[in-house]
């Protein structure tokens, strides 16, 4: 009968969920030592604390392997929710962006926030502006008082994701023509001037709308 009692008591002790994966366990404090590949985690519930043996550490903790015993250690990285090691975050707190294992409220220069994953990814790299082009109107450099001059810049490196926009790569400004009157020329008829003005405006809008030289978003085309 004594044997039967010991067996049943041992069975209930092993089946107690708090003791799962333990090498030594008590009803009050839970595990104090874990099986080889498991991580020891000290859980706090109000005033009480007890040990658990887990396959992976909970959010906010990372698995620290040691010869005596593997333990769950708290992430000490600022604004980090869960981490891979003591100095590498894998998920930041709400409102912060993950970048190279750290959490930022704004992505560093050259990186752009990817809202769906709250990560900083390589952004769009643009070159220097070209010089302003010739002041012209309706493809003419004379015959008007005012014209438009345009400048452009290259996309040097495309963004990692299509959802990341590049800065403007073409811009125009009003300019004063160097020659108000064309030598021996006539003024452009008003209707033609209007048509050409619309055409040029459309071209500039299209250039500004594109956020990459050869990028996939194609908002202008879809």
């Amino acid at each position: 009968q004594g044997n039967r009692w010991r067996r049943s008591k041992r069975a209930s002790y092993v089946s107690n969920p708090i003791c799962k994966g333990c090498l030594s366990c008590s009803k009050d404090n839970g595990c104090s030592r874990c099986q080889q590949k498991l991580f020891f985690f000290l859980r706090r519930e109000g005033m009480r604390q007890y040990g658990e043996c887990l396959h992976s550490c909970p959010s906010g903790y990372y698995g620290h392997r040691a010869p005596d015993m593997n333990r769950c250690a708290r992430c000490r990285i600022e604004n980090c929710d869960s981490c891979f090691s003591k100095d590498f975050c894998t998920k930041c707190k709400v409102g912060f962006y993950l970048h190279r294992g750290r959490c930022f409220d704004e992505c560093p220069d050259g990186f752009a926030p990817l809202e769906e994953t709250m990560e900083c990814v390589e952004g769009c790299e643009v070159g220097h502006w070209s010089e302003w082009g010739t002041c012209s109107r309706n493809n003419r450099t004379c015959g008007f008082k005012w014209g438009l001059e345009t400048r452009t810049r290259q996309i040097v490196k495309k963004p990692v994701k299509d959802t990341i926009l590049c800065p403007t790569i073409a811009e125009s400004r009003r300019c004063k023509m160097t020659m108000r009157h064309c030598p021996g020329g006539k003024r452009t008829p008003k209707a033609k001037e209007k048509r050409n003005k619309k055409k040029k405006r459309k071209l500039i809008e299209r250039a500004q709308e594109q956020h990459s030289v050869f990028l996939a978003t194609d908002r202008a085309n879809q």
Epitope: S130, E131, D162, V213, F214
Partner: antibody, heavy 118, light 110 residues
Framework: QVQLKESGPGLVQPSQTLSLTCTVS????????IHWVRQPPGKGLEWMGA???????YYNSNLKSRVIITRDTSKSQVLLKLNNLQHEDTAMYYC????????????WGQGIQVTVSS | QPLLTQSPSVSASLGASVKLTCTLS???????IEWYQQHPDKSPKFLMQ??????SKGDGIPDRFSGSSSGAHRYLSISNLQLEDEAIYYC?????????FGSGTQLTVL
């Protein structure tokens, strides 16, 4: 491995439409932009246009009214249509892949010789 | 749109050095350009991308090939010329939704 291969007719009659296919392997058309470039005999390279990884298209303004580039991602193919062919459209036609992040052509097809003649 | 100017032909002796020039239209002197090499009856091959300050080469391009810049000029330098360097060299440039090639320079190795 990454490859591009052009296919289509070698001979087309003037005023007809040229249809060329660029079949790609080793990468996805939804990740890369594909361009068409041609080279008339003894002359330099001329950029014709491109289909973006997002599906949009851009063309050389000198050819704009005559050229159409489309793609079929399920077949990994990019198609070039050039209508109202003239003798000066006789050229070697290449498709080329644009590098993922930088704007240059990192992989080229072997090219296909197209002759416009009656 | 940018224009690229290249001299039609250059010749140099085997083992010597040569410098090919590609000139951007002055408005675009800050632009990156690319150099491509094309052997007879072969497809063009990417050599390098060249900015006004640095260059990055394609895979497997020998150290004999290098790039440099000065103002609107972009240079491709080849040292210790080999017979296999005999080819046409094109420069190319991207702008807003287009790509432009230079007319090409025929390099002859004597």
């Amino acid at each position: 491995q990454v490859q591009l291969k052009e296919s289509g007719p070698g001979l087309v009659q003037p005023s007809q439409t040229l249809s060329l296919t660029c079949t790609v392997s080793g990468f996805s058309l939804t990740s890369y932009n594909i361009h068409w470039v041609r080279q008339p005999p003894g002359k330099g390279l001329e950029w014709m246009g491109a289909v973006w990884r997002g599906g949009g298209t851009y063309y050389n303004s000198n050819l704009k009214s005559r050229v159409i580039i489309t793609r079929d991602t399920s077949k990994s193919q990019v198609l070039l249509k050039l209508n109202n062919l003239q003798h000066e459209d006789t050229a070697m036609y290449y498709c080329a892949r644009e590098e993922l992040r930088y704007v240059y052509f990192d992989v080229w097809g072997q090219g296909i010789q197209v002759t416009v003649s009656s | 749109q940018p224009l690229l100017t290249q001299s039609p032909s250059v010749s140099a002796s085997l083992g010597a050095s040569v410098k090919l020039t590609c000139t951007l239209s002055s408005q675009y002197n800050t632009y990156y350009i690319e150099w491509y090499q094309q052997h007879p009856d072969k497809s063009p091959k990417f050599l390098m991308q060249l900015s006004d300050g640095s260059h990055s080469k394609g895979d497997g391009i020998p150290d004999r090939f290098s790039g440099s810049s000065s103002g609107a000029h972009r240079y491709l330098s080849i040292s210790n010329l080999q017979l296999e360097d005999e080819a046409i060299y094109y420069c190319g440039v991207s702008d807003v939704s287009l790509y432009v090639f230079g007319s090409g320079t025929q390099l002859t190795v004597l």
